[in-house]
């Protein structure tokens, strides 16, 4: 009875176990009892990344600049092209088929993690003692100014969006304090 299974780098065809084509090559003709599987290398902009019996190679991915994409790693006959996004943009999916602008952190929020080609900006609310007064994709929350270290006093309290306002100490109060 004919075989029903083949080894891993073989495939069953016409009761024969034929050798699969190596990565980077496509199938031209199946083996016979007396001839080996015939394979041909993929073309310039094509690839196959597994042992296979494909009659056509896959086209390399096109990194469309109109979608904010650029080539991160050029494809070979055995690997697909890897796209990433232009500076200031990140991929919308794992496959990186299109890009969106990095989000900015609004006033009152600072950048916890700067965006990469594949991940968006991560913002965090500025905790007490810190502020951010700009909308930015890079700025972290800044600590309030320490008036004391400048020999000044707080004239206006800080918020998560504004720094404290420092002012000179009252000379009279300062004088009485020392007597």
């Amino acid at each position: 009875e004919p075989p029903t299974a083949c080894r891993e780098k073989q495939y069953l065809i016409n009761s024969q176990c034929c050798s699969l084509c190596q990565p980077g090559q496509k199938l031209v003709s199946d083996c016979t009892e007396f001839t080996e599987t015939e394979c041909l290398p993929c073309g310039e902009s094509e690839f196959l990344d597994t042992w296979n019996r494909e009659t056509h190679c896959h086209q390399h991915k096109y990194c469309d600049p109109n979608l904010g994409l650029r080539v991160q790693q050029k494809g070979t006959s055995e690997t697909d092209t890897i796209c990433t996004c232009e500076e200031g943009w990140h991929c919308t999916s794992e496959a990186c088929e299109s890009c969106v602008l990095h989000r900015s952190c609004s006033p009152g929020f600072g950048v916890k993690q700067i965006a990469t080609g594949v991940s968006d900006t991560i913002c965090e609310p500025c905790p007490v003692g810190f502020f951010s007064n700009v909308s930015s994709a890079f700025e972290k929350c800044h600590p309030w100014t320490s008036c004391e270290t400048k020999d000044l006093v707080v004239q206006q309290a800080g918020t998560n969006k504004t720094d404290v306002v420092c002012g000179p100490q009252d000379r009279l109060r300062h004088h009485h304090h020392h007597h």
């Epitope: 075989p3 029903t4 299974a5 083949c6 080894r7 780098k9 024969q16 050798s19 009892e33 080996e36």
Partner: antibody, heavy 127, light 107 residues
Framework: EVQLLESGGGLVRPGGSLRLSCAAS????????MNWVRQAPGKGLEWVSY????????DYADSVKGRFTVSRDNSKNLLYLQMNSLRAEDTAVYYC????????????????????WGQGTMVTVSS | DIQLTQSPSSLTASVGDRVTITCRSS??????LAWYQQKPGKPPKLLIY???SLEGGVPSRFSGSGSGTDFTLTISSLQPEDFATYYC?????????FGQGTKLEIK
């Protein structure tokens, strides 16, 4: 060192069962296809069974089909042969052997061979 | 199933002799043939794969040839350690099969 070590052989009555084990070491067991091959006393080699690297595909010699089951545990680097309904003609030294795919990109299409063998375990089926 | 027939079944030769063992397949198997050497009480040892490729560490006096249905194993100059039994095996399709063996004895 690349090694295969069979165990579980012994004397069993006709109709009885036995489970052989083959412990692999020195290589990434889960990446290789494996086989069981036996040799009756004073006779030649007889291929018994095959299992793919994942365990998904198996095949057997007609003489053992329906009675023997090959399996593997890649997490433990172990290959098994469950032998049921044993007969006197199953008496043999049982070897586990590693299938290897030799590939030279300049060559035609690559080729298989059994490059690593265990020392064997004796199974005797007798009343 | 594919049958493999080895000839001769046994062979007597002397050290230094050139020896040829043949293996004929009942159907075409391209180059999907391996040759093994086995000594008493030991497991087989792979010599040749893909009909003609020498396994690493095997002396170059061993060579294989053939394709389709007819294959040969040649030992160019027999050494004392070569006296053993030799088997061909087809790995073309399941069930995998072995030849019946050729016992090479010292004259």
């Amino acid at each position: 060192e690349v090694q295969l070590l069979e165990s579980g052989g012994g004397l069993v009555r006709p109709g009885g069962s036995l489970r052989l084990s083959c412990a692999a070491s020195g290589f990434t067991f889960g990446s290789y296809e494996m086989n069981w091959v036996r040799q009756a006393p004073g006779k030649g080699l007889e291929w018994v069974s095959y299992i793919s690297s994942s365990g998904e595909t198996t095949d057997y010699a007609d003489s053992v089909k329906g009675r023997f089951t090959v399996s593997r545990d890649n997490s433990k680097n172990l290959l098994y042969l469950q032998m049921n309904s044993l007969r006197a003609e199953d008496t043999a030294v049982y070897y586990c052997a590693r299938d290897v795919f030799f590939f030279d990109s300049s060559g035609p299409r690559g080729a298989y061979g059994m490059d690593v063998w265990g020392q064997g375990t004796m199974v005797t089926v007798s009343s | 199933d594919i049958q493999l027939t080895q000839s001769p079944s046994s062979l007597t030769a002397s050290v230094g002799d050139r020896v040829t063992i043949t293996c004929r397949s009942s159907q075409g198997i391209r180059s999907s043939l391996a040759w093994y050497q086995q000594k008493p009480g030991k497991p087989p040892k792979l010599l040749i794969y893909g009909a003609s490729s020498l396994e690493g560490g095997v002396p170059s006096r061993f060579s294989g040839s053939g394709s389709g249905t007819d294959f040969t194993l040649t030992i160019s100059s027999l050494q004392p350690e070569d006296f053993a039994t030799y088997y061909c095996q087809q790995l073309n399709s399941f069930p995998s099969t072995f030849g019946q063996g050729t016992k090479l004895e010292i004259k």
